[in-house]
């Protein structure tokens, strides 16, 4: 897995006029990290992890970069003709990455009411865009608002390819986020289904990387995909992640069913409480 | 007493059809998830065929998959092999076999039965 | 599909002797690994599951280690009863045999 910074800008218009407020977020290796959602931006972490991997200063180089980003945004989506009545949004979601041989990556995609009709790769500053006439016509606009003033582009462009892979690496620094494991913790829940059924839910929560196998066995055998229900692996707020994995069995054959769990190399193996217990946990060292 | 017995075995031609059958006494088939292993003469342990104990997971070898069908009838205390388009690498002394519901097992076969000869000429 | 290579093929052993038998998983199995023991003209027999667990009513000079990739059964002191062949089977993914082991007297 690279590593990666994502930024993800969002401007509305209402009849055709901006507004003066703007939805920032920005993800590191996938977590979301920093967020402004005020009129007035004001960065702030998304947890206690982002805290730690900022360090214990002031986020004002953030907030400066992410408000300029958004008055950049919002100009160029003053910009762009044809308005309908109504909501409206602009999107801009820039991404840089560090993969593990150092090699890097860096895009920007603009989504106008989270349709995508422009893409850069800002390495090579090629340009791409859907088929459709209506993002060629947002593209060609776009694109000329951003030409008209090299300046302007200039700062539209600040935080881009270079300042955003720097900031990638100052992150990284921080050692917090460098290649880290945390292990899951693991509960399994049983519920009443129909009769003579119950609903076997093991879940595992505070874990990253998000990477993780959680699966029911029957006697040491998986059971088939469709006999199962997974809940997609999201991210917990902590930094961390969580997903869980349910399937349905007879009563009273709850010991030979186990949910087994690997992440990271390790892995455990955790049974269905019997009877009245209804949570069993277990934390693998 | 605990046993499998194979039987349904037999000389077919190449592309034809068997139905194997494995009878379980001595326990309660419903309860167990169960198998078909087979060995080739002079050769080692092939398994097959898997079947869980409410037949909603079944697994077969690629070299059987489109061509063999496993289930079972626990009323009957009975578990099946439909091998379909034989072919003469099929030939094989063919077993059905429990998993064992120990807890903590981990697809191990406890109970096996004596075997059924198949053999496919062309 | 898990492939398991079973090394030696054969080997050859005296009374008392402590034999071992190595199987290799191509990718890790925890410890989903069972050993079984098969004699001529019968069905195989299981020995060992879960790595390291003794099946009831197999003898203790039997015995299962490792975990991962890399498992081996022991025999600490082979008896005339064990000349036979042996294998080892996954149930990590699906389920697969290993290709067997077989021993004999020197």
């Known amino acids: 897995e690279p590593h990666s910074l994502r930024y993800n800008l969002t401007v509305l218009s209402w009849d055709g006029s901006v507004q003066s407020g703007f939805l920032t977020e920005v993800h590191l290796d996938g977590q979301p990290f920093l967020r402004c959602d005020r009129q007035k931006c004001r960065a702030k972490p998304q947890g206690q992890w982002a805290e730690d991997v900022l360090g214990n200063k002031t986020w004002d180089r953030e907030t400066r970069d992410l408000t300029g980003n958004g008055k950049d945004l919002r100009m160029t989506l003053a910009h762009i003709k044809d308005q309908k009545e109504g909501l409206h949004s602009l999107q801009e979601i820039r991404v840089c990455e560090i993969h593990e041989d150092n090699s890097t990556r860096s895009s920007q995609h603009f989504y106008y009411d989270g349709e995508l009709f422009l893409s850069q790769n800002l390495e090579t500053k090629e340009w791409t865009m859907p088929q459709s006439s209506r993002a060629q016509t947002l593209a060609m606009n776009v694109r000329n608002f951003l030409k008209e003033d090299a300046m302007k582009t200039k700062t539209h462009y600040h935080a881009m390819h270079a300042d955003c892979l720097q900031e990638l690496r100052r992150y990284l620094k921080s050692g917090v986020v460098l290649r880290r494991t945390v292990p899951p913790m693991v509960n399994v829940t049983r519920s009443e289904a129909s009769e003579g059924n119950i609903t076997v839910t093991c879940r595992a929560s505070g874990f990253y990387p998000w990477n993780i196998t959680l699966s029911w066995r029957q006697d040491g055998v998986s059971l088939s995909h469709d006999t199962q229900q997974w809940g997609d692996v999201l991210p917990d707020g902590n930094g961390t992640y969580q997903t869980w994995v349910a399937t349905r069995i007879c009563q009273g054959e709850e010991q030979r069913f186990t949910c087994y769990m690997e992440h990271s190399g390790n892995h455990s193996t955790h049974p269905v409480p019997s009877g009245k217990v209804l949570v069993l946990q277990s934390h693998w060292q | 007493e605990v046993q499998l017995v194979e039987s349904g075995g037999g000389l077919v031609q190449s592309g034809g059809s068997l139905r194997l059958s494995c009878v379980a006494s001595?326990?309660?088939?419903?309860?167990?998830?169960m198998n078909w292993v087979r060995q080739a003469p002079g050769k080692g342990l092939e398994w097959i065929s898997y079947?869980?104990?409410?037949?909603?997971?079944?697994y077969y070898a690629d070299s059987v998959k489109g061509r063999f069908t496993i289930s079972r009838d626990n009323a009957k205390k009975s578990l099946y092999l439909q091998m379909n388009s034989l072919r003469d690498e099929d030939t094989a002394v063919y077993y059905c076999?429990?998993?064992?519901?120990?807890?903590?097992?981990?697809?191990?076969?406890?109970?096996w039965g004596q075997g059924t000869t198949v053999t496919v000429s062309s | 599909d898990i492939q398991m290579t079973q090394s030696p093929s054969s080997l050859s052993a005296s009374v008392g002797d402590r034999v071992t038998i190595t199987c290799r998983a191509s990718?890790?199995?925890?410890?989903?690994l069972n050993w079984y023991q098969q004699k001529p003209g019968k069905a195989p027999k299981l020995l060992i599951y879960?790595?390291?667990s003794l099946q009831s009513g197999v003898p203790s000079r039997f015995s299962g280690s490792g975990s991962g990739t890399d498992f081996t059964l022991t025999i600490s002191s082979l008896q005339p009863e064990d000349f036979a062949t042996y294998y080892c089977?996954?149930?990590?993914?699906?389920?697969?045999f290993g290709g067997g082991t077989k021993v004999d007297i020197k």
């Open positions: 879960a790595a390291s």
């Open positions: 089977q996954q149930s990590y993914s699906t389920l697969t």
């Open positions: 079947i869980n104990s409410r037949s909603n997971t079944i």
């Open positions: 001595g326990f309660t088939l419903s309860r167990y998830s």
């Open positions: 076999a429990r998993v064992s519901d120990i807890t903590g097992n981990t697809g191990a076969f406890d109970i």
């Open positions: 990718q890790s199995i925890s410890s989903y």
